[in-house]
């Protein structure tokens, strides 16, 4: 008996061939001997089976001695043994229909779980193997689960169902809803405008939800909500914003926030959360702001940074085109009685400059000029 595997919702062609290469009488029946379809001369005739409106054949192939049964929009319950009667012979074909579906939605939040469920006909014992877009293989029986979805899990999952040494392939498109970056850091000189961007790692037709940026300033004892906003069909509207600082927000995606001035009291870290409509859980992106200030008070030239810096970052003070006068893994450095000239305050990581502030030191009788 020939075995054919089909996919739920798909179309399948069951073949039946006669030795004579001409149109002769044929009938297709199911295992209960109920007629599905056949011919009467050149006419296609249909029986009282439940397949009636989904069964078809190809007249053009009859003249070649081929009498296919085509079943459209396959259902699991179409799994059966189909019998083709032609030239006093019977050809049997066993059709097994499988379905593979994602547990809920195919749009899942980062960190959530994906469960794939296999629908199979009674009496079958299929095995399933799925390959994620990043090449990870998972195997299982009726259900397959992947916990803690990551951004790289977005894309087409290819699942192969094996039964009777035959296989059928399913492709399921999964979208992991997340920000492109889990965390970002912005380095700014005091007084500069700060731009925060929160690009999403996915695109959908309509995007609706609400969000909020909570900020924990380094100098503050508790965090504070800086802004709340709504997202409707990719249009952003601000609901509430603090007076200090007065953030501005772009009206279109990607989510974009502007802080008019980088000030030491704003240095710290924030957490932007985005709750999407009809989704449980939220998307998160951490953002950090490091602010630098270089000052000269009397005979003391000081450089300071505020905000979340790693212990391996180096803060230096140097006269332009000269060796660093002072260089420390600290958040403040200073030089007493600095020489006149253009001084540079540098925040660097393994030799790479992250932030730079210049201050002009004038001869001792005049006051300093800060560019």
């Amino acid at each position: 008996k020939k075995v054919v595997l089909g996919k739920k919702g798909d179309t399948v062609e069951l073949t039946c061939t006669a030795s004579q290469k001409k149109s002769i009488q044929f009938h297709w029946k199911n295992s209960n001997q109920i007629k599905i379809l056949g011919n009467q001369g050149s006419f296609l005739t249909k029986g009282p089976s439940k397949l009636n409106d989904r069964a078809d054949s190809r007249r053009s192939l009859w003249d070649q001695g081929n009498f296919p049964l085509i079943i459209k929009n396959l259902k699991i319950e179409d799994s059966d043994t189909y019998i083709c009667e032609v030239e006093d012979q019977k050809e049997e074909v066993q059709l097994l229909v499988f379905g593979l579906t994602a547990n809920s939605d195919t749009h899942l939040l980062q960190g959530q779980s994906l469960t794939l469920t296999l629908e199979s006909p009674p009496g079958s014992s299929p095995s399933v193997q799925c390959r994620s877009p990043r090449g990870k293989n998972i195997q299982g029986g009726k259900t397959l689960s992947v916990s803690q979805l990551e951004l790289q899990d977005s894309g087409t999952w290819t699942c192969t169902v094996l039964q009777n040494q035959k296989k059928v392939e399913f492709k399921i498109d999964i979208v992991v809803l997340a920000f492109q970056k889990a965390s970002s850091i912005v380095y700014k000189k005091e007084g500069e405008q700060v731009e925060f961007s929160f690009p999403l790692a996915f695109t959908v037709e309509k995007l609706t939800g609400s969000g909020e940026l909570w900020w924990q300033a380094e100098r503050a004892s508790s965090s504070k909500s800086w802004i709340t906003f709504d997202l409707k069909n990719k249009e952003v509207s601000v609901k509430r914003v603090t007076q200090d600082p007065k953030l501005q927000m772009g009206k279109k995606l990607p989510l974009h926030l502007t802080l008019p001035q980088a000030l030491p009291q704003y240095a710290g870290s924030g957490n932007l959360t985005l709750a999407l409509e009809a989704k449980t859980g939220k998307l998160h992106q951490e953002v950090n702001l490091v602010v630098m200030r270089a000052t000269q008070l009397q005979k003391n030239l000081t450089c300071e940074v505020w905000g979340p810096t790693s212990p391996k970052l180096m803060l230096s003070l140097k006269l332009e085109n000269k060796e660093a006068k002072v260089s420390k893994r600290e958040k403040a450095v200073w030089v007493l009685n600095p020489e006149a000239g253009m001084w540079q305050c540098l925040l660097s990581d393994s030799g790479q400059v992250l932030l730079e502030s210049n201050i002009k030191v004038l001869p001792t009788w005049s006051t300093p000029v800060q560019p």
């Epitope: 798909d10 062609e13 007249r59 085509i70």
Partner: antibody
Framework: QVQLQQWGAGLLKPSETLSLTCAVY????????WSWIRQPPGKGLEWIGE???????NYNPSLKSRVTISVDTSKNQFSLKLSSVTAADTAVYYC?????????WGQGTLVT | DIQMTQSPSSVSASVGDRVTITCRAS??????LAWYQHKPGKAPKLLIY???SLQSGVPSRFSGSGSGTDFTLTISSLQPEDFATYYC?????????FGQGTKLEIK
């Protein structure tokens, strides 16, 4: 909703080989036959040939010696090659899904 | 090959008119016939299959009849969007063949 999207070179010189591809989106690829049909300027429709997912083909005898239709099931695509073209092969070429009737059709590609 | 002959090759009519197009097969094709509507720059659209079955989404003003060698497409009340070229096609045997087309124009 099944959609067919086709592409290929639109301008050829005599004796060259015409090459077109049609991608099937959003529906079953197996169980159907996939056809190529053409319409020369100001003329009627002419069936070129067809293929199914397992590579079984049927061709119009008038073009059979020059036509090759192939299938790539991994991409849900099928292709047409027509060799030794002449000015008489200038037409809009369509791909279409078929059991007995052609539905749906691709958007058409003018090949000159 | 089975030859399909349509008549008339063109017809002028007005909105609201009833229009009939005929198609004749050179041999018996029982009910293995379809009708298509084709507008310039667009893909042909299946209207009627198996001689008289209305394709899903096609307005009920379109109807088909006939069996054997003679077939008819009828548009009961012409609408402005119906002005196009109409083709019949036989699916009885290879090669599939089409009629030469009937152009329906505004009077």
């Amino acid at each position: 909703q099944v959609q067919l999207q086709q592409w290929g070179a639109g301008l050829l010189k005599p004796s060259e080989t015409l090459s077109l591809t049609c991608a099937v989106y959003g529906g079953s690829f197996s169980g159907y036959y996939w056809s190529w049909i053409r319409q020369p300027p100001g003329k009627g429709l002419e069936w070129i040939g067809e293929i199914n997912h397992s590579g079984s083909t049927n061709y119009n005898p008038s073009l059979k010696s020059r036509v090759t239709i192939s299938v790539d099931t991994s991409k849900n695509q099928f292709s047409l090659k027509l060799s030794s073209v002449t000015a008489a092969d200038t037409a809009v070429y369509y791909c279409a899904r078929v059991i007995n009737w052609f539905d749906p059709w691709g958007q058409g590609t003018l090949v000159t | 090959d089975i030859q399909m002959t349509q008549s008339p090759s063109s017809v002028s009519a007005s909105v609201g008119d009833r229009v009939t197009i005929t198609c004749r097969a050179s041999q018996d094709i029982s009910s293995w016939l379809a009708w298509y509507q084709h507008k310039p720059g667009k893909a042909p659209k299946l209207l009627i299959y198996a001689a008289s079955s209305l394709q899903s989404g096609v307005p009920s003003r379109f109807s088909g009849s006939g069996s054997g060698t003679d077939f008819t497409l009828t548009i009961s009340s012409l609408q402005p969007e119906d002005f196009a070229t109409y083709y019949c096609q036989q699916a009885n045997s290879f090669p599939y063949t089409f009629g030469q087309g009937t152009k329906l124009e505004i009077k």
